[in-house]
């Protein structure tokens, strides 16, 4: 997606992108797991939520996340008919009023309680590098993706399109 110039073209476009509708175009309730089939789980500890990446026991129930999909205009130089340049952005909410947020300063992924309209830190560009896997790229920091680091979710910088296929930024969605 980034070509020879890395993320430069894309960085400008993402910062300029705007969500075209305030309501989501579609929503899914799904469990989130890593490329290696570890589950993403959420636990309430000391009045705040922690996010874990772990192997579940055989019959343990997977946590569900509400993924809300928004269309976003992608400014581009392509000579389209106004239709081109749409991206899908998602917000991820494991429980009412809490959303995953990108903390770019700490390179961390956190759960924050907030009201709508959600801040840009809660929006992630949806990528399908493989048909059954998705990646989530920070709207606020193009080229930075949600990934797995030391059994936690973290923000991981991806500097070329080849690295978009690295397993630690690939996730599986399961609606069952």
């Amino acid at each position: 997606a980034f070509g020879i110039s890395g993320v430069q073209k894309y960085t400008r476009a993402l910062h300029d992108s705007s969500i075209t509708g305030i309501s989501p175009i579609t929503e899914y309730l799904a469990s989130l797991s890593t490329y290696n089939d570890q589950s993403i789980t959420f636990a309430l500890e000391d009045e705040s939520y922690e996010i874990y990446v772990e192997d579940l026991k055989k019959d343990e129930k997977k946590d569900k996340v509400l993924l809300s999909y928004y269309e976003s205009q992608h400014p581009s130089n392509e000579s389209g008919d106004g239709v081109d340049g749409k991206m899908l952005m998602v917000t991820l909410s494991p429980t009412k009023d809490f959303w995953l947020h990108a903390n770019n300063k700490e390179h961390s992924v956190e759960l924050h309680k907030c009201e709508k309209p959600l801040p840009d830190q809660a929006f992630f560009v949806l990528h399908n590098m493989h048909s059954n896997c998705v990646s989530f790229e920070c709207k606020t920091d193009p080229g930075v993706f949600i990934g797995v680091k030391d059994n936690h979710l973290a923000l991981i910088k991806v500097d070329s399109s080849e690295n978009l296929c690295t397993e630690n930024i690939l996730f599986k969605l399961s609606e069952t």
Epitope: M87, M129, S131
Partner: antibody, heavy 122, light 107 residues
Framework: QVKLLQSGAALVKPGASVKMSCATS????????VSWVKQSHGKGLEWIGE????????NFNENFKGKATLTVDKSTSTAYMELSRLTSEDSAIYYC???????????????WGQGTLVTVSS | NIVMTQSPKSMSISVGDRVTMNCKAS??????LAWYQQKPGQSPKLLIY???NRYTGVPDRFTGGGYGTDFTLTINSVQAEDAAFYYC?????????FGGGTKVELR
């Protein structure tokens, strides 16, 4: 403007293979999933599969696994589909299509090529 | 695979009529549904996606509705150029499947 230009009609013998092309222009080829759709009188519209030029990842309808092979040439922004071991059941119009979204496949077909007619006959 | 069933198979209408066609999914598909129009000798064209979102450039006389298993495409005040086949398609999940189509012809 977005264009998907497909190769011309093909008349092929049973048991043979055919490879058709879909030359694209007007958009960033590597950033969109390309799908192929079959239209026949007997079965209507059927999705064959899709390919993402950026990663080379593909995804097939089970009914077409082993029948269709999808490839791309990023240097010419062209997608290809090869159909093997052809029978009369494969006689149809084949369309290449593209979705509305950068980077993501929702298997929605926003742009279509003009179609390639394949006739299998001895 | 989820089966998409369209009804009626064909309908004969007059210019200015309001027409509604149906698409039924064999399982709940949420709002993961698209509608296409295909005129003779042409490729299909996307009209509606995610059940009710009109695609860019599609006239506002085309309206999609429904959720779950039952969906409709309505054409308000049909124009002569609307004579075509209309197909519904389940989107998002693989494999996407199409309905058999509804033929709309002018009287």
């Amino acid at each position: 403007q977005v264009k998907l230009l497909q190769s011309g009609a093909a008349l092929v013998k049973p048991g043979a293979s055919v490879k058709m092309s879909c030359a694209t222009s007007g958009f960033s080829f590597t950033d969109y999933w390309v799908s192929w759709v079959k239209q026949s009188h007997g079965k209507g519209l059927e999705w064959i599969g899709e390919i993402y030029p950026n990663s080379g990842a593909d995804n097939f309808n089970e009914n077409f696994k082993g029948k269709a092979t999808l490839t791309v040439d990023k240097s010419t922004s062209t997608a290809y589909m090869e159909l093997s071991r052809l029978t009369s059941e494969d006689s149809a119009i084949y369309y290449c299509t593209r979705g509305p979204y950068y980077y993501s496949t929702q298997i929605i077909f926003a742009y279509w090529g003009q179609g390639t007619l394949v006739t299998v006959s001895s | 695979n989820i089966v998409m069933t369209q009804s009626p198979k064909s309908m004969s209408i007059s210019v200015g009529d309001r027409v509604t066609m149906n698409c039924k999914a064999s399982q709940n598909v949420g709002n993961n549904l698209a509608w296409y129009q295909q005129k003779p000798g042409q490729s299909p064209k996307l009209l509606i996606y995610y059940a009710s979102n009109r695609y860019t450039g599609v006239p506002d006389r085309f309206t999609g509705g429904g959720y779950g298993t039952d969906f409709t495409l309505t054409i308000n005040s049909v124009q002569a150029e609307d004579a075509a086949f209309y197909y519904c398609q389940r989107i998002y999940n693989s494999p996407p499947t199409f309905g058999g189509g509804t033929k709309v012809e002018l009287r």
